[in-house]
């Protein structure tokens, strides 16, 4: 079996302030089992945007139903974008661990740019 890859097909996305950003991410394998998380930025200071396993993320919706059998689409939408949301977003696959899940592989990132609303 080929090792799972995390595909973020869009290097960059431009969204007008107040609109919804769609950040695309798919994985190429059902193996290993484990959740997806989305982060803004990289390294220890990265900001968690969405965690499939747990948490409350009122601005985020998933494009696909995460409970759908054999789901490999982990794209998200972020509503009511503001300039403060600009940055690079990473889709990160975790593998099931005991007791904690373990980071497995990251996508290449998608840079979100925000266009100011015309005044």
């Amino acid at each position: 079996e080929e090792e799972l890859q995390v595909i973020q097909p869009d290097k960059s996305v431009l969204v007008a302030a107040g609109e919804t950003a769609t950040l695309r991410c798919t994985v190429t394998s059902l193996i290993p089992v484990g959740p997806i998380q989305w982060f803004r930025g990289a390294g220890p200071g990265r900001e968690l945007i969405y965690n499939q396993k747990e948490g409350h993320f009122p601005r985020v919706t998933t494009v696909s139903d995460s409970t759908k059998r054999n789901n490999m689409d982990f794209s998200i939408r972020i509503g009511n974008i503001t300039p403060a949301d600009a940055g690079t977003y990473y889709c990160v696959k975790f593998r099931k661990g005991s007791p904690d899940d373990v980071e497995f592989k990251s996508g290449a990132g998608t840079e979100l740019s925000v266009r100011a609303k015309p005044s």
């Epitope: 089992v33 959740p35 396993k53 948490g55 995460s66 409970t67 054999n70």
Partner: antibody, heavy 119, light 110 residues
Framework: QVQLQQPGTELVRPGASVKLSCKAS????????INWVKQRPGQGLEWIAM????????HYNQIFKDKATLTVDKSSNTAYMQLSSLTSGDSAVYYC????????????WGRGTSVTVSS | DIVLTQSPASLAVSLGQRATISCRAS??????????IFWYQQKPGQPPKLLIY???NLDSGVPARFSGSGSGTDFTLNIHPVEEEDAATYYC????????FGGGTKLEIK
């Protein structure tokens, strides 16, 4: 840490109904299927049914479709299975189990509820 | 429904030796390159524990002495070298369609 809490025992009269509970914690309840499995004393495992807590979609083993009814309460992160018209053949341990990979498998299990049907 | 037949129903294996358990499906449980077979271990008074998913992938925390193989209709769980704590009943399960379990194999350590 994923946990599925089930009451230890239920004693019920023949012909009555019982509603078994499975309280989930440590993960987003609506993101993962819940399965129910029956095990009679000294016997093997029988899959009863599964429910998607996000929209209450259910799939039943045909053998149990007139016996078991699955529901969820999203406000309390609890899955329920009601068993009706109980007979001695329904005396068993009933497990709930969570499907972490959307593969229709059972990754995390509750400790089970022992149901005894006796007059 | 797909029926899973496990064999043997019970076996006794000496400490340090190999235990081999078979699971045969009444029709193929493979689809899109995946084999939808799972293996569980159950000890008395405990719930089952997932060991192997999609036929050959070890679940987290499962010792490497456990391995799974097979495709289509014929699958095998191997334990080598067997340890005392491996005494348990082992079940296969498929999810090619709605799930069903095999009848179980009781492993005794000699």
């Amino acid at each position: 840490q994923v946990q599925l809490q089930q009451p230890g025992t239920e004693l019920v009269r023949p012909g009555a109904s019982v509603k078994l509970s499975c309280k989930a914690s440590g993960y987003t309840f609506t993101n993962y299927w819940i399965n129910w499995v029956k095990q009679r004393p000294g016997q093997g495992l029988e899959w009863i049914a599964m429910i998607d807590p996000s929209d209450s979609e259910t799939h039943y083993n045909q053998i149990f479709k007139d016996k078991a009814t699955l529901t969820v309460d999203k406000s309390s992160n609890t899955a329920y299975m009601q068993l009706s018209s109980l007979t001695s053949g329904d005396s068993a341990v009933y497990y709930c189990a969570m499907d972490y990979g959307s593969l229709y498998a059972m990754d995390y299990w509750g400790r089970g509820t022992s149901v005894t049907v006796s007059s | 429904d797909i029926v899973l037949t496990q064999s043997p129903a019970s076996l006794a294996v000496s400490l340090g030796q190999r235990a081999t358990i078979s699971c045969r499906a009444s029709k193929s449980v493979s689809s899109s390159g995946y084999n939808y077979i799972f293996w569980y271990q159950q000890k008395p008074g405990q719930p089952p524990k997932l060991l192997i998913y999609l036929a050959s992938n070890l679940d987290s925390g499962v010792p490497a002495r456990f391995s799974g193989s097979g495709s289509g209709t014929d699958f095998t769980l191997n334990i080598h070298p067997v340890e005392e704590e491996d005494a348990a009943t082992y079940y296969c399960q498929h999810s090619r369609e709605l799930p069903t379990f095999g009848g179980g194999t009781k492993l005794e350590i000699k």
